[in-house]
């Protein structure tokens, strides 16, 4: 692992940008600069090794001033002012603004569905495997174990409210304690962020938008992995959220509530349901250890059943067995009782897509899977396309101030609340936070929300999820109202915990330096975005499942050095920026390891070697491919959408010669232009939202 | 309507066998159990044991075990009960019996009996 | 096994009288017993199954009660063709077994 990619014999200098060092990227962006610059601003060309080449593009040019590739880009208006125009041209503006907006409102409609869909996917894939992790018995003593589970289960079923009613129906039903469910519910936490991580990959085909979304999605996995860090430890030696939820618990008497209002779904589910509907309950009795339930599938079939309660003869080994002493006898062959059964005759079948295929359900889920991320990368493609078509000029500087200038002096401190309540608010009205913060991503990527402002907004997006659970939970019926209200209340006082740790400071704010980082990182070595998820979400948590499995002794053995060398690490990387004078010449830097282990380059060169192979096929027959060839490949030309990467050698060759900064090509239309790819006159009949 | 019709009667030597059918009809053979009783002379009821045609799953009383077969034909819906080293306690009348599987309504409908001797 | 004990062995009584003949298992069975009806020279015929409930076409003056180890079966009004010996079984457990029987005659 190397302790931070491309270090080099740069020497800590805080003035100096360094690539992937996250430590010295501003927190906030200049807003004094922020306001004249345009898109054709430069980059130095003295000091080369220090300048980033996030432009897959190299273009050859003599940089003027250093730029902040954390500044938002000015999306320039293109198209004729709103005075200029005539009443015809106003007349056809207008339309265009609103054809824009049902074509926006449309696209993100079938962006939550499809979100909506890859839940619904992910449970067909992985859900039984889901059901199985919590079966696991060592759960119970193990919190560690619980909290890879968390994670492993909500990546698997893509929604931490199924991973979360999972736990809380094995809490009322006494397979597990609340304190062993903690764990669980941090880890669901951590897995949830895995779907705005994944929206973000589909913006890596311009790098300064990829960086910028890169890191607002993962500014929310930051936030709760390193919540979980500080918190499970202090939960394991205090207890403190299981004893002040009982508290709360055990103070109120609680009414069963109504059930929580379905906003958003009342309108996604006359659609989603039409392709795919679930039995969520299998998933629930696999991880009750219900054998009968391991042979079901999740596909439903049956949509409207009768239920009736009738007794039934059933065979027992011997008389003894019998459910009730009056309600046995033989037969002479047979020993027999009585068992009251429910017997659920189907009336209707349901109405979707999958309900006369029979087909298994790993088949079903990975034609849903892909065909769900093929709607949610076009969907995204095209709200990016409009939004970038309507948010110019004076349109962007209106609500890029509005959403990202502070409250006035005084109050400046409290701005980042309020966006914690809008967060909070929203998420409750959608009803998810993959949802919310999915959606987020993308206004990142194109600059219209800063990470600054998107953090605490990702950050009221955890309460919003945890006030739904709050009311989903007051709703249940007696037997799983305390265990179901203790456990949201658990998941609620962990993200307030985590608030409190990681934002009211703004030195605490590490999970915005952290994911800064990572979108720099991310931005160069694209593959890298994917190997951080891979890592992060299914190797880190399977590995610790495995050893923990093994046995404490063996997780102790293998966890203890490798936590042991991750802080040393990160003690020397914070002596070598802050006071490099009290460490030896040689540990003054990385160099003493091998490159391998210091820089993501050779690295690069295997992957680059691994996808080689794509590189020369990169044809770019449509958008969704082209995104995903980008991904793979690095390719400068397909992420412009020509026809084939012909001049890949050529861009290769001049990769060492200094390169517009990130922010030239930001906008897609305004970059194509520049590079002679679209008419001048094209533009011109763009049309500026009003 | 229901009827289980037996063999007719046997005059058997000791240590010999006897095979006494049951032929069914009226109803469906392999919804039901066949139990075998049998009745000395002067003397109460004794089960002797039962069979279920559907996959002839078997059971004797401890005292026949060894002694007795029984077997079903569901082509022809006939049950057999066969009792081999006959002696002269077993003279008596074999009645077979029809017992609804899975259900506890008991032996609800009787043959008219098939009367073995036993005599030297 | 289970024995049951059934009493009297015999019973002589008058034509509209109230019969009444008890069983007695060794152990518990529950509710798990039949009773028959053997006229002289024919086969049995099922009176009574589960303890109390009446089988089909059995006529409503026979009537079935008891739990556990004790049973009864009640003619409420003896009429002649009711001449018969009754025997009571149980099938709590295998084997099946049966009582004695009890003869019932009109004087």
């Known amino acids: 692992m190397a302790p931070w990619p491309e270090l080099g014999d740069a020497q800590p200098n805080p003035d100096k940008y360094l690539e992937g060092a996250a430590g010295q990227q501003p927190t906030a962006p200049d807003k004094s600069k922020e306001t004249n610059k345009t898109d054709n601003t430069e980059a130095p060309v003295t000091k080369i090794e220090l300048l980033p080449s996030y432009s897959t593009a190299t273009l050859i040019d003599e940089p003027t001033e250093v730029d902040d590739p954390w500044n938002l880009p000015t999306l320039q208006d293109s198209g004729i002012k709103w005075s200029e125009r005539d009443t015809k041209g106003k007349i056809l503006c207008f339309f265009q603004g609103i054809g824009r907006l049902i074509l926006l409102l449309g696209f993100l409609y079938f962006f939550v569905c499809s979100l909506d869909i890859l839940s619904s996917a992910f449970q067909l894939v992985g859900g039984k495997m889901a059901g199985q992790f919590f079966s696991n018995s060592s759960i119970m003593s193990n919190p560690l174990l619980g909290l890879v589970i968390g994670v492993l289960v909500t990546v698997l079923v893509q929604s931490s409210s199924t991973s979360t009613s999972i736990v809380v129906s094995m809490v009322s039903s006494s397979l597990l304690t609340v304190r062993a469910a903690i764990p669980i519910i941090m880890g669901a936490n951590i897995g949830t962020s895995i779907t705005n991580t994944i929206v973000a990959l589909m913006q890596v085909g311009d790098r300064s938008e990829f960086r910028r979304a890169f890191a607002g999605a993962t500014v929310h996995d930051f936030f709760n992995w390193l919540s979980v860090l500080v918190l499970l430890p202090v939960e394991v030696a205090t207890h403190y959220l299981e004893i002040i939820t009982q508290l709360i618990v055990e103070s109120f008497h609680f009414k069963n509530g109504e059930d929580a209002p379905d906003l958003l779904k009342v309108i996604t589910k006359p659609f989603t349901k039409l392709i795919v509907q679930l039995d969520k309950k299998v998933i629930s009795q696999i991880a009750m250890n219900d054998e009968k339930a391991k042979n079901k599938s999740l596909v439903k079939i049956w949509c409207k059943t009768f239920t009736n309660k009738t007794q039934i003869n059933v065979t027992v080994p011997s008389t003894a067995n019998c459910t009730s002493p009056s309600l046995c006898w033989t037969d002479g062959i047979q020993n027999w009782t009585m068992k009251n059964v429910t017997y659920k005759e189907n009336i209707a079948k349901c109405q979707h897509i999958f309900v006369n295929f029979h087909l298994p359900d790993l088949a079903v889920g990975t034609i849903l899977l892909i065909l769900s991320l093929l709607v949610l990368c076009g969907c995204l493609i095209m709200i990016v396309k409009i939004l970038g078509s309507v948010l110019k000029g004076q349109v962007a500087t209106v609500i890029k101030k509005t959403i990202n200038t502070d409250f006035p002096f005084p109050f400046a401190w409290l701005t980042g609340y309020l966006a914690i309540l809008v967060g909070a608010g929203m998420t409750f009205i959608v009803q998810s936070s993959s949802v919310f913060t999915s959606a987020l991503t993308p206004l990142i990527g194109i600059g219209v929300i800063t990470i600054e402002r998107a953090y605490p907004l990702t950050l009221g997006s955890n309460i919003g999820t945890t006030t739904t659970a709050i009311l989903a939970a007051l709703a249940s019926p007696g037997n799983a109202l305390r265990s179901s209200l203790q456990i949201a209340l658990c998941h609620f006082f962990f993200n307030i915990s985590g608030i409190l740790l990681w934002y009211p400071i703004p030195f605490t704010r590490l999970p915005i330096r952290m994911a800064k980082g990572l979108g720099n990182i991310s931005a160069k070595y694209r593959w890298f975005a994917v190997f951080y998820l891979i890592i992060f979400f299914f190797l880190i948590p399977l590995t610790v499942f495995g050893l923990s499995l093994a046995g404490w002794r063996v997780l102790v053995g293998v966890g203890v050095p490798v936590v042991f060398i991750i802080i040393l690490v990160l003690c020397l990387r914070l002596l070598q920026s802050r006071c490099p004078r009290v460490l030896p010449k040689k540990l003054q830097n990385w160099n003493f390891l091998p490159l391998w282990m210091r820089s993501l380059k050779p690295w690069d060169a295997v992957v680059s070697k691994f996808t080689g192979c794509f590189q020369m096929r990169c044809c770019c027959c449509c958008r969704v491919c082209c995104r995903a060839c980008c991904l793979l490949c690095d390719c400068p030309k397909c992420c412009r959408c020509s026809k084939c990467c012909e001049d890949l050698e050529e861009a290769q060759e001049g990769q060492d010669v200094p390169v517009k900064a990130p922010e030239t090509f930001d906008n897609i239309t305004i970059s194509r232009e520049a590079q002679g790819e679209v008419p001048a006159s094209d533009s011109k009949t763009e049309c500026t939202a009003l | 309507q229901v009827q289980l019709v037996q063999s007719g009667a046997e005059v058997k030597k000791p240590g010999s066998s006897v095979k006494v059918s049951c032929k069914t009809s009226g109803f469906f053979f392999t919804e039901y159990i066949i139990h075998w009783v049998r009745q000395a002379p002067g003397q109460g009821l004794e089960w002797i044991g039962g069979?279920?045609?559907?996959?002839?799953?078997?059971n004797y009383k401890q005292n026949f075990r060894g002694r007795v077969t029984l077997t079903a034909d569901k082509s022809t819906s006939t049950a057999y009960m066969e009792l081999s080293s006959l002696r002269s306690e077993d003279t008596a009348v074999y009645y077979c019996?029809?017992?609804?599987?899975?259900?506890?309504?008991?032996?609800?409908?009787w043959g008219q009996g098939t009367t073995v001797t036993v005599s030297s | 096994d289970i024995q049951m004990t059934q009493s009297p062995s015999s019973l002589s009584t008058s034509v509209g009288d109230r019969v009444t003949i008890t069983c007695t298992a060794s152990q518990d069975v529950g509710t798990a017993v039949a009773w028959y009806q053997q006229k002289p020279g024919k086969s049995p015929k099922l009176l009574i199954y589960?303890?109390?409930t009446r089988h089909t076409g059995v006529p409503e003056r026979f009537s079935g009660s008891g739990s556990g180890t004790d049973f009864t079966l009640t003619i409420s009004s003896l009429q002649p063709e009711d001449v018969a010996t009754y025997f009571c079984q149980q099938y709590r457990t295998s084997p099946l077994t049966f009582g004695g029987g009890t003869k019932v005659e009109i004087k």
């Open positions: 589960w303890a109390s």
């Open positions: 019996a029809r017992w609804r599987n899975a259900y506890y309504s008991a032996m609800d409908s």
């Open positions: 069979i279920i045609p559907n996959n002839d799953v078997t």
